[in-house]
């Protein structure tokens, strides 16, 4: 899915109102020095691509994030504010249902959620090089087109 035409401000609002708090709850009890963020993103569509991948794609040692509250709210926000996103996710949802297991919070999952928090930080405030980086924030209440 190409996240270029999402309403980034609405997604950001959804993140700050609820998703961020769910991520903090998930990470509660974890030391702030425990994980080093290794996944990065360069602009908002790229950040959403990485966020989607880490949130919904099972990885070795962490297969259950998609069932967490923050994941369900992330999916809802993308479905509402990214035109055509829902249609692209039907097959992925079916596959996810087949792969369901009981929820287990592993250290690998905690590390992955720490990565997610970092990706969301960059989504909320892209740090772009100044030369030709007018797309730090676009005008409000319209779809955003980024060219990189």
């Amino acid at each position: 899915y190409d996240f270029t035409n999402c309403d980034f401000e609405k997604i950001k609002a959804a993140y700050l109102s609820t998703i961020s708090k769910d991520l903090i709850t998930y990470m509660s009890g974890t030391k702030s020095t425990e994980f080093n963020n290794t996944v990065s993103c360069s602009n908002r569509p790229h950040c959403l691509t990485e966020i989607q991948s880490l949130t919904f794609n099972p990885t070795a040692g962490c297969a259950s994030l998609a069932k967490e509250m923050f994941a369900m709210k992330t999916k809802a926000a993308l479905a509402i504010w990214c035109p055509g996103y829902s249609e692209t996710q039907i097959n992925a949802t079916q596959a996810m249902k087949k792969a369901r297991k009981s929820k287990v919070t592993t250290n690998k999952c905690l590390e992955q959620v720490s990565q997610l928090q970092g990706l969301w930080r960059r989504f909320n405030r892209p740090l772009l090089k100044q030369q030709g980086s007018s797309d730090y924030k676009d005008d409000d209440d319209k779809h955003h087109h980024h060219h990189h």
Epitope: L16, N37, S40, W120, R121, R125, Y136, K137
Partner: antibody
């Protein structure tokens, strides 16, 4: 506990440079942006720039016309702000600050470093 | 650059009364506004982020509102420890900019 500890006060001559350090502890240094803000005596706050210690990416306030350089040393969890071609108007308290967990604010601040520029 | 203009420059309010500080942006900053409190000789402290979200440990008497270009910080019942200078900041576009500050005193 998250802490940002800055280097001590400096007195500099006009035309010279100053380098202020900001040592971070209590969190993974490379995961959060470090901001630099200054405050002239009796004045308000002025954002100078930001660095991502993870990859060295920066964004500067162009009002400083290339006089500011931000760097970060991951091995010592220390960020640096260098300001060149100093003039008397650069006399100020210089603060480093960390972005918060959402990336939308500055939650932890250093104690400030007073830089005095005088001939 | 986006200019953030606070009003009033200074404000005197009686203990227990409501204090209201306004911040106007020269162009829309969506909801990307933060409020800080600064006391003499100290660095600023984060109060409110993204217009209306309380930072951890900030008392409920502090609240933020607004969107677009007009924003407000309200202290519902002024306490002695609230005497400080308050700054709004926009993080919608580089360079990030602050308001000039509002000095809050007790009447």
């Amino acid at each position: 506990e998250v802490q940002l500890v800055q280097s001590g006060a400096e007195v500099k001559k006009p035309g010279s440079s100053v380098k202020v350090s900001c040592k971070a502890s209590g969190y993974t240094f490379s995961n959060y942006l470090i901001e630099w803000v200054r405050q002239a005596p009796g004045q308000g706050l002025e954002w100078m720039g930001v660095i991502d210690p993870g990859n060295g990416d920066t964004n500067y306030n162009e009002n400083f016309k290339g006089r500011v350089t931000l760097t970060a040393d991951k091995s010592t969890s220390t960020a640096y702000m260098e300001l060149s071609s100093l003039r008397s108007e650069d006399t100020a308290v210089y603060y480093c600050a960390r972005e918060d967990n959402t990336g939308t604010a500055f939650d932890y601040w250093g104690q400030g470093t007073t830089v005095t520029v005088s001939s | 650059d986006i200019v953030m203009t606070q009003s009033p420059d200074s404000l005197a309010v009686s203990l227990g009364e409501r204090a209201t500080i306004n911040c106007k942006a020269s162009q829309s900053v969506s909801s990307d506004v933060t409020w800080y409190q600064q006391k003499p000789g100290q660095p600023p402290k984060l109060l409110i982020y993204y217009v209306s979200n309380h930072y951890t440990g900030v008392p409920d008497r502090f609240s933020g509102s607004g969107s677009g270009t007009d924003f407000t910080l309200t202290i519902s019942s002024l306490q002695a420890e609230d005497v400080a200078v308050y700054y709004c900041q926009q993080h919608h576009r580089f360079p990030l900019t602050f308001g000039q500050g509002t000095k809050l005193e007790i009447k």
